[in-house]
Interface confidence: medium
């Protein structure tokens, strides 16, 4: 007879801490099953043999050491094999086994779908010792079951290197259909066929699918899950969903919008970010893409000038970033700029046109006829030049920049002078005697500094002797500047 019922934590109880609704085990003591006198743990176990019933599930002791008693085979008692319940219900199931008291340190572990359950608030093991055997009941409880609890649960026990395995307890959590694949939003070409997929599972099975378009059922007869709906084509946007039905009821998928691809809307808010003499940096806000990704954009540029031929320059660019630097423009010119973008369906209309201007350019030519001569009495160098013929786009001449480089043995230094636009001559002090002075001049406008003239060299002798002949830029056709002493 069972004289005592105990509930203890076994060595290594299976799960941590209590879950609401589960029993609390005492995790502080280690249990050794009572060792009853008269039994010696000297049992022999049958080897595994092909065809032998219960192999791996049953430990079959032969005899006790005294040889007088044959102990019954060790096996978990049969229990319920299949539990069907609804989601969010509680469930409790157990394994039980009677173990002779000669065995010590027995442990029952729970496994689900072939994987050991490494921890559980859910597991409790109770021991009912008698004179010769201890009945062990390992209970497993789950509060508010979910689909993830579906599976095959077994108990395992190790005794003398033999593994005893219980029959599986299959837990089937039933509920409303659960979608494993729902239709996805799509952007489709007008009047072109496309497919939508819907898949749902139980248990319980079967799961049947109805399709819904704009709140109306598409199919009169349900299709077994999974279902593929082929839509021959649409001319306008539609919303599709699917209904999944099983014996527990119905679940409706999310509604998905199927859009019809169209040409994009024109870009808006074309803005000027930066203007130079020959380039303009613009940005724009893309219009609606027409449910199809932008492929590229086109920047259209017209010169606003009564004398221009009215031709349009077109610059193609990627759709992103929404920015483009228009290059190769005339300085000090006015332009009208528009942007259009395209997707796979076609080009958008052009954005509203905006006006933009380039700034003054730098001069494109250097001053002419540069001559240099030494004025020894004043110890300076006279420089003369002719004003360059600049284009209107270069803007108004604001002055000249003179570079003079002084070179003597081991020394070289460059100095820069700025003179006003009304000048066509300048004087610079002699910096070094017995040296060469190299002079170059550039015209300056608000647009910048133009190119420097070809260098003109003059030798500055030591004090006391000098030739006053000038040095000048070469006549056209001469290869090098000349130095006249």
């Amino acid at each position: 007879a069972i004289t005592e019922a105990r509930e203890e934590a076994k060595p290594y109880p299976l799960f941590p801490g209590p879950l609401p609704g589960s029993l609390q085990t005492d995790h502080t003591s280690l249990l050794s099953l009572p060792h009853t006198s008269g039994y010696q743990p000297a049992l022999m176990f049958s080897p595994t043999q092909p065809g032998r019933p219960y192999t791996g599930n049953v430990a079959i002791p032969r005899v006790t050491s005294a040889g007088s008693k044959l102990l019954p085979p060790l096996a978990f008692k049969h229990t319920v094999g299949h539990i069907i319940l609804s989601e969010h219900k509680d469930v409790k199931f157990n394994c039980s086994i009677s173990v002779p008291n000669i065995y010590q340190d027995t442990t029952i572990s729970w496994w689900k779908d072939g994987k050991e359950l490494l921890g559980a608030h859910h597991a409790i093991t109770q021991f009912y010792p008698d004179d010769e055997v201890t009945a062990i009941i390992a209970s497993f409880s789950i509060t508010s079951v979910q689909r993830s609890d579906n599976g095959s649960y077994i108990c395992k026990m190790k005794i003398n290197n033999e593994e005893i395995v219980s029959d599986p307890i299959y837990i089937e959590v039933q509920g409303l259909p659960h979608f494993t694949k729902q239709p996805e939003s799509m952007n489709v070409t007008r009047n072109t066929a496309f497919n939508l997929t819907c898949q749902a599972v139980g248990p319980p099975e079967p799961v049947n699918i109805f399709w819904v378009q704009n709140s109306s059922r598409v199919n009169e007869q349900p299709e077994k899950s999974p279902s593929v709906l082929t839509v021959p084509g649409l001319t306008e946007m539609a919303v599709f969903s699917c209904e999944a039905h099983n014996d527990k009821g119905l679940t409706v998928s999310k509604g998905v919008q199927i859009n019809i691809k169209a040409i994009p809307s024109p870009p808006t808010e074309v803005s000027i970010h930066n203007s130079t003499a020959h380039s303009i940096l613009i940005s724009w806000v893309p219009g609606f893409d027409g449910y199809s990704p932008f492929r590229n954009c086109s920047v259209q540029v017209k010169e606003v000038d009564p004398l221009s031929n009215g031709s349009v320059m077109i610059f193609n660019t990627s759709a992103s970033p929404h920015m483009y630097q228009i290059k190769q423009l005339q300085a000090l010119a006015n332009y009208s700029i528009g942007v259009s973008c395209m997707n796979e369906i076609g080009w958008s209309a052009v954005s509203p046109w905006i006006l933009a201007s380039t700034t003054e350019g730098a001069p494109s030519v250097a001053p002419l006829n540069v001559t240099v001569f030494l004025n020894e009495s004043r110890d300076n160098v006279d420089i003369r030049w002719m004003k360059p013929l600049t284009k209107r786009q270069a803007g108004e001449l604001v002055g000249y920049r003179i570079s003079h480089v002084w070179q003597s043995a081991g020394i070289s230094k460059e100095l820069l002078e700025e003179v006003g636009q009304n000048n066509s001559r300048a004087q610079i002090s002699v910096q070094v005697h017995n040296a060469t002075c190299t002079v170059r001049i550039a015209a300056v406008t608000k647009g910048g500094v133009g190119p420097f003239s070809d260098p003109v060299k003059i030798f500055i002798p030591a004090h006391g002797w000098v030739d006053h002949a000038p040095s000048s830029t070469p006549a056209p056709g001469n290869a090098d500047p000349v130095l006249i002493i």
């Epitope: 934590a9 060595p11 109880p13 299976l14 799960f15 941590p16 442990t107 050991e116 490494l118």
Partner: antibody, heavy 124, light 107 residues
Framework: EVKLVESGGGLVQPGGSLSLSCAAS????????MTWVRQPPGKALEWLGF??????????EYSASVKGRFTISRDSSQSILYLQMNALRAEDSGTYYC???????????????WGTGTTVTVSS | DIQMTQSPASLSASVGETVTITCRAS??????LAWYQQKQGKSPQLLVY???TLAEGVPSRFSGSGSGTQFSLKINSLQPADFGSYYC?????????FGGGTKLEIK
């Protein structure tokens, strides 16, 4: 004081073998599940396998990445856990830790005590 | 196998701030979740088990929460000793798996 000390790491060529040891002290070694975890340089921790306790026959479980190449065993008398690693690959390089499950395994399969680690480098 | 996804992968914070690290399981793991702290060049240390129970000796500024598939570790009033990497690990069933880690750095 509960203590785990790993040893046996070093440099080994791809395809080679290495055996790591973990000396345990300060607790009843036979009562605990014991595990090996590794950490490649600069990467996350990866569980390799464990050895169940005496009551569960010291049976073993392995991760898919090392199953068939690595073997976990114990010497209960000396309280040593072993990891025998064969057919090593470059991706097996890293720091190898041994750790124990808490004394009441049913308290959960987390790791309450860790060793200091030993470094394994697999390179030609 | 159950996948554990940790976020963010890295985080900068100042001493005294409060930070939260999250961990998501690919399926229901009830409360079978542990958190570990690992400092550079050191072995991991258990911080939290059963999703919210602090391990022995862990300061009360650490707290764990969550169950099912969503979990978080909160550190109040960050101290210099708290900087390092943090890992979550499930132990619902074999194989136990770790998250990819969160590196907590000083701002």
């Amino acid at each position: 004081e509960v203590k785990l000390v790993e040893s046996g790491g070093g440099l080994v060529q791809p395809g080679g073998s290495l055996s790591l040891s973990c000396a345990a002290s300060g607790f009843t070694f036979t009562d605990n599940y014991m595990t090996w975890v590794r950490q490649p340089p600069g990467k996350a921790l990866e569980w390799l396998g464990f050895s169940r306790n005496k009551a569960n026959g010291y049976t073993t479980e392995y991760s898919a990445s090392v199953k068939g190449r690595f073997t976990i065993s114990r010497d209960s008398s000396q309280s040593i856990l072993y990891l025998q690693m064969n057919a090593l690959r470059a991706e097996d390089s890293g720091t190898y830790y041994c750790a124990r499950f808490p004394p009441h395994y049913y308290a959960g399969g987390y790791f309450d005590v860790w060793g200091t680690g030993t470094t394994v480098t697999v390179s030609s | 196998d159950i996948q554990m996804t940790q976020s963010p992968a890295s985080l900068s914070a100042s001493v005294g701030e409060t930070v939260t690290i999250t961990c998501r399981a690919s399926e229901n793991i009830y409360s079978y979740l542990a958190w570990y702290q690992q400092k550079q060049g050191k072995s991991p240390q258990l911080l939290v088990y059963n999703a919210k129970t602090l391990a022995e000796g862990v300061p009360s500024r650490f707290s764990g929460s969550g169950s099912g598939t969503q979990f978080s570790l909160k550190i109040n009033s960050l101290q210099p000793a708290d900087f390092g990497s943090y890992y979550c690990q499930h132990y619902y069933r074999t194989p136990p798996t770790f998250g990819g880690g969160t590196k907590l750095e000083i701002k």
